[in-house]
Every structure is written in structure tokens, then in C-alpha cells.
Amino acid sequence: MAPWPELGDAQPNPDKYLEGAAGQQPTAPDKSKETNKTDNTEAPVTKIELLPSYSTATLIDEPTEVDDPWNLPTLQDSGIKWSERDTKGKILCFFQGIGRLILLLGFLYFFVCSLDILSSAFQLVGGKMAGQFFSNSSIMSNPLLGLVIGVLVTVLVQSSSTSTSIVVSMVSSSLLTVRAAIPIIMGANIGTSITNTIVALMQVGDRSEFRRAFAGATVHDFFNWLSVLVLLPVEVATHYLEIITQLIVESFHFKNGEDAPDLLKVITKPFTKLIVQLDKKVISQIAMNDEKAKNKSLVKIWCKTFTNKTQINVTVPSTANCTSPSLCWTDGIQNWTMKNVTYKENIAKCQHIFVNFHLPDLAVGTILLILSLLVLCGCLIMIVKILGSVLKGQVATVIKKTINTDFPFPFAWLTGYLAILVGAGMTFIVQSSSVFTSALTPLIGIGVITIERAYPLTLGSNIGTTTTAILAALASPGNALRSSLQIALCHFFFNISGILLWYPIPFTRLPIRMAKGLGNISAKYRWFAVFYLIIFFFLIPLTVFGLSLAGWRVLVGVGVPVVFIIILVLCLRLLQSRCPRVLPKKLQNWNFLPLWMRSLKPWDAVVSKFTGCFQMRCCCCCRVCCRACCLLCDCPKCCRCSKCCEDLEEAQEGQDVPVKAPETFDNITISREAQGEVPASDSKTECTAL
């Protein structure tokens, strides 16, 4: 057991400080301290008495309270009550609160900016490859290939709006039919859900927090995957999305509207454009088989250009190639015609970091990918820390009750639909489902929002992003208006269909159950989260892509047996849990299979072996680094000073009484002090709003 303060020694009356205590509660014996205790047993006592900031922190819960790991944690108030403060304390507390709010908004701002830059980084690293995916001619005939291209491209450019805008431009220029575009849009919907899953990985440090965050993020993934699983075959068979949207587009005489308002971008763009600016047209040009675009850089160099349209004389092989009969002449040898040429004169360079480096896109992308992930991770940790210290006591109670409580009977069922509307509205405001769901993820992690409530918010976010696309479509030029509107509407009705499938009836809310299942697995084997990400967003789509290129026969030949095995396993699993008596004794459980086929334990051993080398060099330098380490190696003895692994391991292994994670403490310093690692300081007093 990690060195925890012995509460028995610390306070004469533990009842006073322990949540729901009725008499003396059992304490967790401090094994590690017992071995190296000096005669002076009072040392830790004085330390704790000096720190009222955490003297009320509950380290031991009643076991019954945490039987269900999905129960929201009690965000315990560890500060002095407002009424008990003197004027100076109240003023100090007020300014602390303001300071926290400013910090929270600041970190939130950089969090959103880092998501934007992460998207740019992905586009620099994989944008051109993504563009080339689109230039594959088989998309037209193979909806499955269209689907995986949608997934891969969106994952590579980290932006569904980029991939859908490429699709729109391809449809407008007749390189793609709406029918062929629909699976790509479905794939883009799946691909966009990777962002918040990556954000969830940043919360790997605390098992229970990670369990909730990862499940909260992957509920989006499962909703999208399940929707596609049902709706893609339905669409291929009936073309209902294509027909409905075509009827809508044809029945209304739309006039070009105004652009969808860029509400969040207005705030973030001034900062992000100082980091990097991209020429997104290059990806579209590659997708449309423009050979010249393949050698162009995505990094924008010139921001102010003067476009001059001039007519130049060009030779043509014959008069038939002339622009028009009247614009055709000869010099006696060659035939000439006049061509309109747009001459672009560069006037002013862009003002961003990479403008004068002339680095290849891959290098810039890699640099930005690393930096944006670090900033994202850092901001997320700080947001979680600040929220953790703000959302305590009455504040937490009020917020949690507001967010997670249903309307009174008989209107309880309406709550979820209101949450869908809120999710849609918020996404419309921030103009990005990735930003909204990524901001939601840490809140799920720290226990402010339940997964049951996050689910409709996420579904609403899916709707919100399509309304943005519809507005953007209405603002597009005449030739692209119809196609972009029809595709935006396909996206909209696909999400509506998905909601109708997986939300109204509580029994059908499979994504929640699946996400919780994955959350439990990932909390136990944290490497599995990365494994899941790679498998679902890269390997499966790439395999399908590869098999599709090999032809229908190969795809069916490999796909049918795989699908058959999956269905067989699912049916067997269902029978095992519902009516095992129907099955022969051997099939009533999975024990007939070798251990590696039915358990992650052997795989865990393999992964641990591979990542053993990381544990040795693992980082005591900073919490961010440690989180990365924990994610890689699921390490029990990794960087104790950052307290992100070891304490939790020991707390969760072989403990009858569940010990709360050190996140209960208000900050790292306090938790370290409590463990006897940092000299105590009486200057720190915690302040909560209520």
C-alpha cells in the first residue's frame, strides 16, 4: 500500500471528518510507513493538523458505495464554509474563484485551439494520402469501400467537415454520385468520433476516471458504428436517404443563404493562425485527380495574393481545339487560340510560425501533432484539476442534480430529448461536434455528467454538426448548392435514423452498454484502449480497403467467414447469458477455448513484456509524461512522485475497503504532502465557492 496518512492518528474524532460516519470507521493500515517509522509518530499528525485544506478529505468509503464502478464519485468539499470565513478570507476566496474561472476559460481556450491544431497536424501528415483515397474509382460501385474511405479520410484529417466538403466538391463536379457519397458520409461520421476518444486517453492516470471518460467517449463511436451496421445495408437495399433528400432538395427552391456563423472560430482563429495556416484546397484538388496538387504544400505561405485575369495566346494542335472559332488564328505554321489565364501575384506572406521554415508537410505535421497532443493533454489535466477543486460540495450537488436529474413523472422521458437539443445547440454554437464531445469527455471522467446523460448530449452533437453543414450548404455557390445540400441532408437523416434506432426505447440503448463494457476492460487493461483505437479506426478500415481493392470476390471470401464467426460468437454469448441450459455443457462457458482466445490476461503479459523497457526509464519529471507512461505500460511501479499509477494499483488490488483515488485531494502538492513526500506548508488553504 502506498504511504497514506493514518487517519486514526491524525484526528481525535474521525467521525467529524468522515462522510456518513457512524462511529469509528475502519482505517487502511499504512504498510509502507510501518517499516520505516521513527519514534516520532507525531510527525504525520502535526502535518495533517497544519492542513485543514485536506483534513476533511475522505480517503475511505463504505464498500457498498462503490460496488458499482459507474456510480458517480462524491466530489467532497474540503474547504472552510463561507459563513465561517472572515472578511479577508471571503475576499481572498472570491478572487480565488475569479482566478480559477479565468484559468478554466484559458485552459479551455487552449484546449479548443489544440484540437484545431491537432486537426491541422493530421491534415499535414495524412491529408494528401486522404485525398488519394478519394481518387479511387471503385468507390462508385462499392459502398463498403466508400464507408472505410470516409472513416480513414476523416481520421487522417481529423475533421468531418473537411472530408464532407471534398465529397461535396466531387459530387458537384460529377466525379461522384450522391449514391456513392452516402457511405462516405457515414464513414466520416464514424471518423469524427476518434477525437474525443483520443481526449479520453489523456485521462488514463486514474482508473475510475478513465473508465468513465473512455466509456463516455466511445459511446459516440458505438452509436456511429451500430448505426452504420444497420443503416448502410438498409441504404444499399432501399436508397431511402438518397430518395428522401432528393425529394426535399427538389421540392424547395432554395436561394443561396449566408454562411453558417463562425462563433467559436472567431475566438480561436487569431491564435491558431499564428501557429499554422493550411491551404485546404490542395486535398480537394488531389481528390479530384489534379496532378499538380500532389506536389503542392498544404502549408499556406502567401495570405495576400492579387489575382489578375489575363488572356494569353497558346498554340493548339488543330483549329478544333480552339476556345471558339472566333478566337482561332494561325501564324502560318501553328494554330493559335486565346486562353483566359488567372495570374496569381503573391503580395504578403502569412504570419505563422512555419511560414519561413520551408519544411516538408510531414515534418510540420509531426511537430504540430506532438505539440498539440502535449498542449491538449496539459490543458485537459489542468481543466480536470480546476474543475475538481471547483466542483465540490454544494456546487457539485447543484450541477450534478441539474445535469443528471430527469424531469418529474410523467415527463421523465422528455429529459433525454432536451439533452439532445442542448447537445445540438451547443455543437451549433461551437461549430464542431469534436470540440463539444471532447469538452464533454473530462466532465464525464470526473463524474459531473453520467454516461446516461452524456449519450443524448452526444447524439445531439451529431445532429448539431449536420445543421451546421446544412447552413454551409445553403451558402454554397449555385453549382454546388444542390449537391452540398443533399449530402448535408443525407448526413442529417442518417443521424436522425440512428437516434430513432438506438435511443427512444431504453432497451435499444446498446451503445451505452457497449461503451461501459469497453470502459471496464480499458480500466483493467489500459493498453486495450489504444488497441481499440488502432483496430477500429485504422486496421479494420484499412483491411476492408485493401480487400476491396482486391475485388468483390476477395472481400466476400474473407468477409463472410469473419461475419459468420462474429454472429456465431454473439449468438453463443447471448445463449450463455440468457438460457445456458439449451447449450451442451461444453458450450455453456468459454473454457473450452485456450486462455489467449477468451481472456486478455495472457495478452496483458505480452504487452507488459514489450513495454517493460518503458517502465525503467519512466518519467518522474511530470504528470503528463507519467500519464503517457501509464497508458503504454499499464505500469504498477511507474513514477510514484506523479502518483498516477502506483497508488491506484495498490488501492485497487487486494483491498477490501476501497480507497479513494488521490484525485480527492485538491492538488498534487497536497496529495504528496499527505504521502509524506513534500514538506507541509500551512500557507495553502482551500477555497470552494459554496
Partner: antibody, heavy 120, light 107 residues
Framework: QVQLVQSGAEVKKPGASVKVSCKTS????????MHWVRQAPGQGLEWIGA????????SYNQKFKGRVTMTADTSTSTVYMELSSLRSEDTAVYYC?????????????WGQGTLVTVSS | DIVMTQSPSSLSTSVGDRVTITCKAS??????VAWYQQKPGQSPKLLIY???TRHTGVPDRFTGSGSGTDFTLIIRSLQPEDVATYFC?????????FGSGTKVEIK
């Protein structure tokens, strides 16, 4: 200044060939197309063809195809026009001319002309 | 081949008069038309190209206009030195073709 000096008058029998030369000076020889135009006595102008001395590319009027050959000698900055299987109707003044107005077929410098008489 | 029909074939007028010569192409030639002046015993001389662009050294009393199939050369105020034969030429298609010419004389 630009000068085009043509060879002297020729008298040929029907069926024979004639080779008219045009020596140029005052400009970069390989820059401009050289055109050959003929004018029968008291008649209008008729375009025979053109040559680009830079590459030797030629273009002939379909009417003269198979009978006319244009060549250029860059060492002497001279262009030659040979017309074979002469007939009495080929009697005309043959002009060499260049177009310095790039990309057009409007010719702005002309030689003094070479009279070719075809008679038995 | 594109046929250039020039009219009139000849005209006789007084010094200072306005002279109009027309040229009609058998098909659309855009603006790829040139006008030449040929004095007796001399080589032709370029006056106008691209229908209306005067060649260097050509007096501004010579004006060209038209497009497509109908073209006009106007001598605003005829001078004694303008006595010559005027030819139109199209360079829209190979072979280049000339009009039959208009002989301008002074009464």
C-alpha cells in the same frame, strides 16, 4: 534594319523546277516565320506556305502540296523555296516575307520579289 | 479554304474623300484580318492587323473595323500617295487567303 534579298528572275520550261532563295539580315534569323507568297501578273496575292527556320517546321497550302519544298540554312540565314513540275500558270512574282508580329499571319516585311516565268 | 470577297474591285475618287473598302469572309474569322497596300511595281506593305491595329508608321487616316465575317478599311481623307491596290487577308485558318484586291485611283 530588317532586309530580305531575293535571288534574280528565272525562266523555266514546263515540268522543270525552280529554287528561289531569300537571304535575310537585320534580325535573328530563327525567330520569325518565313512566308512565301506569289502574285500572277495583274492578279491578287496567293499564299504558298511558310517555314519556321528555328525548327525547320513547314506548312504548305494544299494547292501546292507535293510540289513545293521550303528549307532554311541557318549558317547563311537564307531560306529556299523550290517549286517543281512547273506549269505556265506558275508564272508569277514570288515574294518571301516575314511576320515580326508574333503569333500572327500578318506579314510586315517583304522581299523585292523574284519573277519566275514558265514558258516552252 | 476561306474565301475573302473584296469590294469594290476598283474605285476612283478625289483627294480628301473618304474611301471605304469592304471584305467579306466565307466563314467566321474572328478578328484575324490584315490589310495590305501595294503600289505599282512594289512589294505589298502591311497597313493593319488584328482588324484594327495600325502597323508602325501607318498614318492614322487608315482605320480598320469589323469582326466575324464582315470587315472594312476606311481611308478618312484620301491623299495622292494612297493610290494603290489594297488587299485584305485572313489568318484565321491555314491556308492564309487574300482578297482579290481593290484598286484605288484619283480622278
Amino acid at each position: 534594319q530588317v532586309q530580305l534579298v531575293q535571288s534574280g528572275a528565272e525562266v523555266k520550261k514546263p515540268g522543270a523546277s525552280v529554287k528561289v532563295s531569300c537571304k535575310t539580315s537585320g534580325y535573328t534569323f530563327i525567330t520569325y516565320n518565313m512566308h512565301w507568297v506569289r502574285q500572277a501578273p495583274g492578279q491578287g496575292l496567293e499564299w504558298i506556305g511558310a517555314i519556321y527556320p528555328g525548327s525547320g517546321d513547314t506548312s504548305y497550302n494544299q494547292k501546292f502540296k507535293g510540289r513545293v519544298t521550303m528549307t532554311a540554312d541557318t549558317s547563311t540565314s537564307t531560306v529556299y523555296m523550290e517549286l517543281s513540275s512547273l506549269r505556265s500558270e506558275d508564272t508569277a512574282v514570288y515574294y518571301c516575307s516575314i511576320s515580326t508580329i508574333i503569333t500572327t499571319g500578318a506579314v510586315d516585311y517583304w522581299g523585292q520579289g523574284t519573277l519566275v516565268t514558265v514558258s516552252s | 479554304d476561306i474565301v475573302m470577297t473584296q469590294s469594290p474591285s476598283s474605285l476612283s475618287t478625289s483627294v480628301g474623300d473618304r474611301v471605304t473598302i469592304t471584305c467579306k469572309a466565307s466563314q467566321d474569322v474572328g478578328t484575324a484580318v490584315a490589310w495590305y497596300q501595294q503600289k505599282p511595281g512594289q512589294s505589298p506593305k502591311l497597313l493593319i492587323y488584328w482588324t484594327s491595329t495600325r502597323h508602325t508608321g501607318v498614318p492614322d487616316r487608315f482605320t480598320g473595323s469589323g469582326s466575324g465575317t464582315d470587315f472594312t478599311l476606311i481611308i478618312r481623307s484620301l491623299q495622292p500617295e494612297d493610290v494603290a491596290t489594297y488587299f485584305c487577308q485572313q489568318y484565321s485558318r491555314i491556308p492564309l487567303t487574300f482578297g482579290s484586291g481593290t484598286k484605288v485611283e484619283i480622278k
